[in-house]
């Protein structure tokens, strides 16, 4: 059956970029790197310059939603993190500009950002029970939980 968000007519309007040039580290202290053009994976790095730097853009929902809805873009590019299905790699989608309005099937570009202390979780708006996750010897993907790692630390202001 289609995900809930596809059935509803919720519209998400772009507000602003709320974070620039941050790194995501998983619970094993692995950083997200860009692998082979359109994929992301996690690796323990000696040189943090190899880690992807992301920007985060905030969206406001047409229904009064308390959740923070965000888009993730690789800094200084037009590449946006895009969800597929469970256990499928997230992809990098090239778009000429940040979408002003997102609805329907395009919600695979959006994530609910939740924080619990220093732990950050990104739930797919298109698949609300699935998180951005790292998985051993695999790409960054969508997963429901263990054995995939779904909590991330945000590292800002890395030189």
């Amino acid at each position: 059956s289609a995900p809930f968000s596809f059935l509803s007519n919720v519209k998400y309007n772009f507000m602003r970029i709320i974070k620039y040039e941050f790194i995501l580290n998983d619970a094993l202290n692995q950083s997200i790197i860009r692998a082979n053009d359109q994929y992301l994976t996690a690796a323990a790095l000696h040189n943090l310059d190899e880690a992807v730097k992301f920007d985060m853009g905030a969206y406001k929902s047409s229904k009064d939603d308390a959740k923070i809805t965000v888009i993730l873009r690789i800094s200084k590019t037009q590449l946006y993190v895009t969800a597929q299905d469970e256990d499928q790699p997230v992809l990098l989608k090239e778009m000429p500009e940040i979408p002003k309005t997102i609805t329907g099937s395009e919600t695979n570009l959006l994530f609910f950002w939740e924080t619990h202390g220093t732990k950050n979780y990104f739930t797919s708006v298109a698949h609300p029970n699935l998180f951005i996750a790292t998985k051993q010897d695999y790409w960054v993907c969508l997963a429901g939980g263990p054995p995939s790692i779904t909590d991330f630390q945000i590292l800002e202001n890395q030189a």
């Epitope: 790197i33 860009r34 200084k76």
Partner: antibody, heavy 122, light 107 residues
């Protein structure tokens, strides 16, 4: 230790084909694209193109479309560059080089093979 | 496609000299510029990535700067082992073009 080891020098006649190999070790082969770079005698470096080592999809620079083919054997972490219908102007050193993204946006070639000299002569 | 224009094509300098090479891109490459060193008969080596970041193990006498379309590579005090050809390369978009190279010789 990360290494790219290329096959040995080749001498071919015009019209023949050549296949150069590049065996990678010391890293996860499918995480990094493989580039091919040509250097004719006394000339500059020319970026020929790259192959996505996960999907096998290749991208070729305009001057290298047609007679050049990049392939893979992921079971042995080896990339190949095949050149058909050889001409004298194909005489050059061919390098493979691992591609890496810095900050997820800026592409560089951080490890290089030792180069394979291909000589085309009748 | 982005074209890279490197100058000078050759350069003669003395040991201890400060040496500067420039590279100009045909459009803004957002600091996504790398420099390589190739010694005679050897494989190219990455020296500097993202305009100014020194690749691990590279001596600190090598440096890079620039923005937009104009970039500079500098050797602060030339050493005999620096005799090589130096290439810039843009890493922003396909195709990842190299500059024409600068051959550096000792006076």
């Amino acid at each position: 230790e990360i290494q790219l080891v290329q096959s040995g020098a080749e001498v071919k006649k015009p019209g023949a084909s050549v296949k150069v190999s590049c065996k990678a070790s010391g890293y996860t082969f499918t995480n990094y694209g493989m580039n091919w770079v040509r250097q004719a005698p006394g000339q500059d470096l020319e970026w020929m193109g790259w192959i996505n080592t996960y999907t096998g999809e290749s991208t070729y620079a305009d001057d290298f479309k047609g007679r050049f083919t990049f392939t893979l054997d992921t079971s042995t972490s080896t990339a190949y560059m095949e050149l058909s219908s050889l001409r004298s102007e194909d005489t050059a050193v061919y390098f493979c080089a691992r591609g890496i993204y810095y900050y997820g946006s800026s592409y560089a070639m951080d490890y290089w093979g030792q180069g394979t000299t291909v000589t085309v002569s009748s | 496609d982005i074209q890279m224009t490197q100058s000078p094509s050759s350069l003669s300098a003395s040991v201890g000299d400060r040496v500067t090479i420039t590279c100009r891109a045909s459009q803004d490459i957002s600091n996504m510029l790398n420099w390589y060193q190739q010694k005679p008969g050897k494989t190219p080596k990455l020296l500097i990535y993202y305009t100014s970041r020194l690749y691990p193990g590279v001596p600190s006498r090598f440096s890079g700067s620039g923005s937009g379309t104009d970039y500079t590579f500098t050797i602060s005090s030339l050493q005999p082992e620096d005799i090589a050809t130096y290439f810039c390369q843009q890493g922003k978009t396909l195709p990842y073009a190299f500059g024409q190279g600068t051959k550096l010789e000792i006076k």
